[in-house]
Amino acid sequence: GLECDGKVNICCKKQFFVSFKDIGWNDWIIAPSGYHANYCEGECPSHIAGTSGSSLSFHSTVINHYRMRGHSPFANLKSCCIPTKLSTMSMLYFDDEYNIVKRDVPNMIVEECGCS
Amino acid sequence: GLECDGKVNICCKKQFFVSFKDIGWNDWIIAPSGYHANYCEGECPSHIAGTSGSSLSFHSTVINHYRMRGHSPFANLKSCCIPTKLSTMSMLYFDDEYNIVKRDVPNMIVEECGCS
């Protein structure tokens, strides 16, 4: 997956730091105080749709076969720049019963982006 | 995840059968001859972005906090109707060395859709 560098407008991963205080979650998340969540942005022209090597690759490659041949309804279906690889991060937080929990939370950090 | 029923234009799962013969893959995929791959289509208005209960839910909920508050650049970032739950299917196929392989292939079938 591409890293956004300001020079490309193709689907890429943009660095982004989330502050839990900013979004009002610091009342239940003890640590960390924030993290690099990152996000995906950019264009997905038809020639790169479904070519991300993502977890959706078999499915998106299949759909792209139809899209590239102008098969209705896929010709009009927009391909999206989305997370294709996410990673886990450890957090210390209060659960519903106010117990302190330390847990690896899946799908917190966007590692790679690709076109759906 | 919603099933498309022709009445809603909100992000939903559309039934779709893929014929491997149609896409020219029947030379290497022995069986099955096709499968219900399905796909996602529909609108993702801001009030349902990141509310899909998807595998991206922590990340997309975080991003949505910023989006809903009009935080640049998320206010302009389009939320996409994407697969949020995929399932595995068994396939019988020729590998690169023309051995016949029977294997469960992940992420072949879209089971649920949601907004990124």
């Epitope: - | 059968f17 014929s19 013969k21 068994s90």
Partner: antibody, heavy 116, light 105 residues
């Protein structure tokens, strides 16, 4: 609702020709293979052959090659099984079946009786 | 040519487990499917891709593969399960087994 509706029972004399039909509805007829299966009185199932209505690609069991002809007319979602010269040993129930992940839908069967 | 061998008949008491075998070669290169056929009716797919059950088929039906044998198992057999059962080997073409008559005593 997926349905395969076969033509009615036939009584023929040896040497006569015959064409029986199988009409599909409730699904994309051109995207699934249709198989034909013979069941002689009091006996088991025998696979005769299969056709892909999308392009009329046909495969026969070695036992039935040259004995019958399988065809399809996609404009009316119908597959056919025909004989140019019937024999008494062709007396049987003939089923058409849609090939999905196996023969997932079957016609009601056409009983063919060949007797002098 | 490829052949599948099934026992002609299997008997089971109600509530017991019935096992129907299907012997053939190279199951690693083929899928096993199983069909149930009741008198005067069309066959019904009960197991596909070796072990999977179509929607609407009761959980008591299961399939397995071990070595050269595919097996259909019916646990807690009911009177309504009395029927002929056919295995099918599916790759580029198709072969059916000779069929097994299941009798529920």
């Amino acid at each position: 609702e997926v349905q395969l509706v076969q033509s009615g029972a036939e009584v023929k004399k040896p040497g006569e020709s015959l064409k029986i039909s199988c009409q599909g509805s409730g699904y994309s007829f051109t995207s699934y293979w249709i198989g034909w299966v013979r069941q002689m009185p009091g006996k088991g199932l025998e696979w005769m052959g299969i056709i892909y209505p999308g392009d009329s690609d046909t495969r026969y069991s070695p036992s039935f090659q040259g004995q019958v002809t399988i065809s399809a007319d996609k404009s009316i979602s119908t597959a056919y099984l025909q004989w140019s010269s019937l024999k008494a040993s062709d007396t049987a129930m003939y089923y058409c079946a849609r090939q999905g992940l196996g023969f997932d839908y079957w016609g009601q069967g056409t009983l063919v009786t060949v007797s002098s | 040519s490829y052949e599948l061998t099934q026992p002609p008949s299997v008997s089971v008491s109600p509530g017991q487990t019935a096992s129907i075998t299907c012997s053939g070669e190279k199951w690693g290169e083929k899928y096993a499917c199983w069909y149930q056929q009741k008198p005067g009716q069309s066959p019904v797919l009960v197991i596909y891709q070796d072990t999977k059950r179509p929607s609407g088929i009761p959980e008591r039906f299961s399939g397995s593969i071990s070595g050269n044998t595919a097996t259909l198992t019916i646990s807690g057999t009911q009177a309504m399960d009395e029927a002929d059962y056919y295995c099918q080997a599916w790759d580029r073409s198709t072969v059916f087994g000779g069929g097994t008559k299941l009798t529920v005593l």
